[in-house]
């Protein structure tokens, strides 16, 4: 629970508690913003980001955005609040422990995004269908 000596200031979004009343501590994420990447046509890639940050707010999760256009490939790694859209998309998979890439519709480029909620989980980004629950075969296995 929140210790009584830790003041809970008005509108304080820095103190977040879980269902047990324990204070939620922020997670660690890779945070290199946008960098050029060599990750292409692979089942998974490492971010090659050497910066691990303490997310500013405890509710933030790790996010990775992979983009490919005619000129280059970039990988973006950040912390972000899942209550807010990122690149105009909702972070649907924010509770996942792994960063499973999902394709999003963006004109003029190939755009994949993932989010996750374990320490440095956006260091390993996964494109492989075997991890993706939008795969009907996998859903069949899960529900059998």
């Amino acid at each position: 629970t929140i210790p009584p000596h830790v003041q809970k200031s008005v509108n304080n979004d820095m103190i977040v508690t879980d269902n047990n009343g324990a204070v939620k501590f922020p997670q660690l994420c890779k945070f290199c913003d946008v960098r050029f990447s060599t990750c292409d046509n692979q089942k998974s890639c490492m971010s090659n980001c050497s910066i691990t940050s303490i997310c500013e707010k405890p509710q933030e999760v790790c996010v990775a955005v992979w983009r490919k256009n005619d000129e280059n490939i970039t990988l973006e790694t950040v912390c972000h609040d899942p209550k807010l859209p990122y690149h105009d998309f909702i972070l649907e998979d924010a509770a996942s422990p792994k960063c499973i890439m999902k394709e999003k519709k963006k004109p003029g480029e190939t755009f994949f995004m993932c989010s996750c909620s374990s320490d440095e989980c956006n260091d390993n980004i996964i494109f492989s269908e075997e991890y993706n629950t939008s795969n009907p075969d996998l859903l069949l296995v899960i529900f059998q």
Epitope: D18, N20, A22, V23, F25, L28, I54
Partner: nanobody, 119 residues
Framework: EVQLLESGGGLVQPGGSLRLSCAAS???????DMWWVRQAPGKGLEWVS?????????YYADSVKGRFTISRDNSKNTLYLQMNSLRAEDTAVYYC????????????WGQGTLVTVSS
């Protein structure tokens, strides 16, 4: 009973240094990550630094990177925060904290120690 007791706070001039200590008891100190968290007057919590159980992995908020150093001595059950090049905006109550983990769903906090940076 779990106890975290901070010490080392005080009044210091801008550019000066302080070393905070946190003595832990009542739990297996060496088996979990530890944090320094601060709260400036009338502000929310700021998560300053985190250290892994072996002391090998350390993490810092951008606001203190290059100025603060977190360390621990598991043989003495003590956590430290070396604060250099202090600024007025570092003025806050500094708390030593242990976050929830897979072995313990609870978070533990010290009573805090006040650091005032002023000329």
């Amino acid at each position: 009973e779990v106890q975290l007791l901070e010490s080392g706070g005080g009044l210091v001039q801008p550019g000066g240094s302080l070393r905070l200590s946190c003595a832990a008891s009542g739990f297996t100190f060496a088996q979990g990550d530890m944090w320094w968290v601060r709260q400036a007057p009338g502000k929310g919590l700021e998560w300053v630094s985190r250290i892994g159980m072996d002391g090998d992995k350390t993490y810092y908020a951008d606001s203190v990177k290059g100025r603060f150093t977190i360390s621990r001595d598991n043989s003495k059950n003590t956590l430290y925060l070396q604060m250099n090049s202090l600024r007025a905006e570092d003025t806050a109550v500094y708390y030593c904290a242990k976050g929830p983990s897979s072995t313990s769903p609870f978070d533990y906090w010290g009573q805090g120690t006040l650091v005032t940076v002023s000329s």
